[in-house]
Interface confidence: medium
């Protein structure tokens, strides 16, 4: 009995289907397969749990959060046991195994091992001002998404003309900070916080409005 | 893998409609900004329009050549774009191509494109 | 409305750098793009926000942006990467995207 080789790692953005890929060859018919899926999840190493499993011409369900979301993707008994997972959760992220035996062949690769991701988009980001908005002050903008994986990159841009930040401004597009200095009347404006990632993309504006001076009565 | 299949290309006649589509898998589609691109056959890359995220306002934008005759709509539930062509013009003949606007808002630029759909306005 | 001109052709022997030149008014104040489209495909982005590469792209391409002018450079350039080249620019925040009309890269 031999498992193919799995493709190594899968990607799937949060809520959408994953299949997960394992064939075998045999020797033997198919009349005592058993099929083991089990799963190391990322976020409970220690913790091995059953996804899914074939024995005795039958299927029986594994961990409780599995419930009916999980399949073989063909009609069993077959040498292609890949299963899908239906509505993929952060919490499927993991590495998962199929064990494969079918008795009285033995000897081989009995073991694939799968990589699975689970991708999210960010949330719509928190813009927000840090400082005095008077002129000629330094101002900080801020922006974070609390969800993202892989983690979001920030990109500040000046919903004018041109796009680009003020030459004033320095960006910092891992910690979603642009630092503009000795803000001026040009600097007056709406700024967009674009967060994104390999799978989404999420905005929040923000209106800097620079204050003069205002002039003092004589007299 | 991020992918976008357009269709509804076809022929037809001056004065005419048709509507595309573009089936988008591999990505959250309710959160991408959406934009179409044309080429005329044997011709450069011509910006048609684009489309926002319902989060971000859903707005659109268009070219000035296809103001007012072209329309972009989404349907998030189906994770399609559409783009509805009236009073098509001769000079409307090209290939569309759906792509995703990435990287940025405004400044991304746009990845990935569709395979394109021709799109034929003759009498 | 804003327009961006390019050469229409460049030519270049393998290993080679090639250069590929994009203008328009006050280019450098906004952002550039460069998009590279092989014969009966769809156009691929190889730049984006004057400089950056998206995941995928060979270290060989490059990009810069000031002035009046943007370029995409392509040093030690191979076989394959012979294509047509599109720059393009922001426009304004109601106009996605403005193109350059093309430049045809032959690697001799």
């Known amino acids: 009995l031999e498992v193919s080789e799995s493709p190594g790692s899968i990607q799937v953005a949060r809520g959408q289907p994953a299949v997960l890929p394992c064939t075998f060859t045999t020797s033997a018919a198919l009349i005592n397969l058993n099929v083991i899926w089990m799963v190391t999840p990322l976020s409970n190493a220690n913790q091995p749990e059953q996804v899914i499993l074939y024995q005795g011409g039958q299927m029986f369900d594994g961990a409780p959060r599995f419930h009916g979301r999980v399949g073989f993707t063909g009609t069993m008994p077959a040498t292609n046991v890949s299963i899908f997972i239906n509505n993929t959760q952060l919490s499927d992220t993991g590495t998962y195994q199929c064990l494969v035996n079918n008795l009285p062949d033995i000897g081989g690769r009995n073991i694939g091992v799968t990589g699975l991701t689970v991708l999210v988009p960010p949330s719509a980001p928190h813009c927000q001002i840090q400082g005095s908005q008077d002129i000629g002050s330094d101002v900080i903008l801020l922006c974070s998404s609390e969800e993202g994986i892989p983690r979001p990159t920030y990109l500040w841009e000046k919903l004018d003309n041109t796009l680009k930040l003020p030459p004033t401004a320095t960006q910092d597009q891992v910690q979603g900070t642009v630092t503009i200095r000795n803000i001026s009347a040009l600097s007056s404006g709406l700024y967009q916080c674009v967060a994104s990632n390999a799978i989404g993309t999420s905005t929040c504006l923000l209106d800097l409005q620079v204050i003069s001076p205002q002039p003092r009565n004589i007299g | 893998e991020v992918q976008l299949v357009e269709s509804g290309g076809g022929l037809v006649k001056p004065g005419g409609s048709l509507r595309l589509s573009c089936a988008a898998s591999?990505?959250?589609?309710?959160?991408?900004?959406m934009s179409w691109v044309r080429q005329a056959p044997g011709k450069g890359l011509e910006w048609v329009g684009r489309?926002?995220?319902?989060?971000?306002?859903?707005?659109?934008d268009y070219a000035a050549p296809v103001k007012g005759r072209f329309t972009i709509s989404r349907d998030d539930s189906k994770n399609t774009l559409y783009l509805q062509m009236n009073s098509l013009k001769t000079e409307d003949t090209a290939v569309y191509y759906c792509?995703?606007?990435?990287?940025?808002?405004?400044?991304?630029?746009?990845?990935?494109w569709g395979q394109g759909t021709l799109v034929t306005v003759s009498s | 409305s804003y327009e961006l001109t390019q050469p229409p052709s460049v030519s270049v022997s393998p290993g080679q750098t090639a250069s590929i030149t994009c203008s328009g008014d006050k280019l450098g104040d906004k952002y550039a793009s460069w998009y590279q489209q092989k014969p009966g495909q769809s156009p691929v982005l190889v730049i984006y926000?004057?400089?950056k590469r998206p995941s995928g792209i060979p270290e060989r391409f490059s990009g810069s942006n000031s002035g009046n002018t943007a370029t995409l450079t392509i040093s030690g350039t191979q076989a394959e990467d012979e294509a047509d080249y599109y720059c393009s620019s922001t426009g304004t925040a109601h106009t996605l995207a403005v193109f350059g009309g093309g430049t045809k890269l032959t690697v001799l």
């Open positions: 792509a995703r606007v990435a990287h940025g808002g405004y400044s991304g630029g746009l990845d990935p």
């Open positions: 926000q004057d400089s």
């Open positions: 591999g990505f959250t589609f309710s959160n991408a900004w």
């Open positions: 489309i926002k995220s319902k989060t971000d306002g859903g707005t659109t």
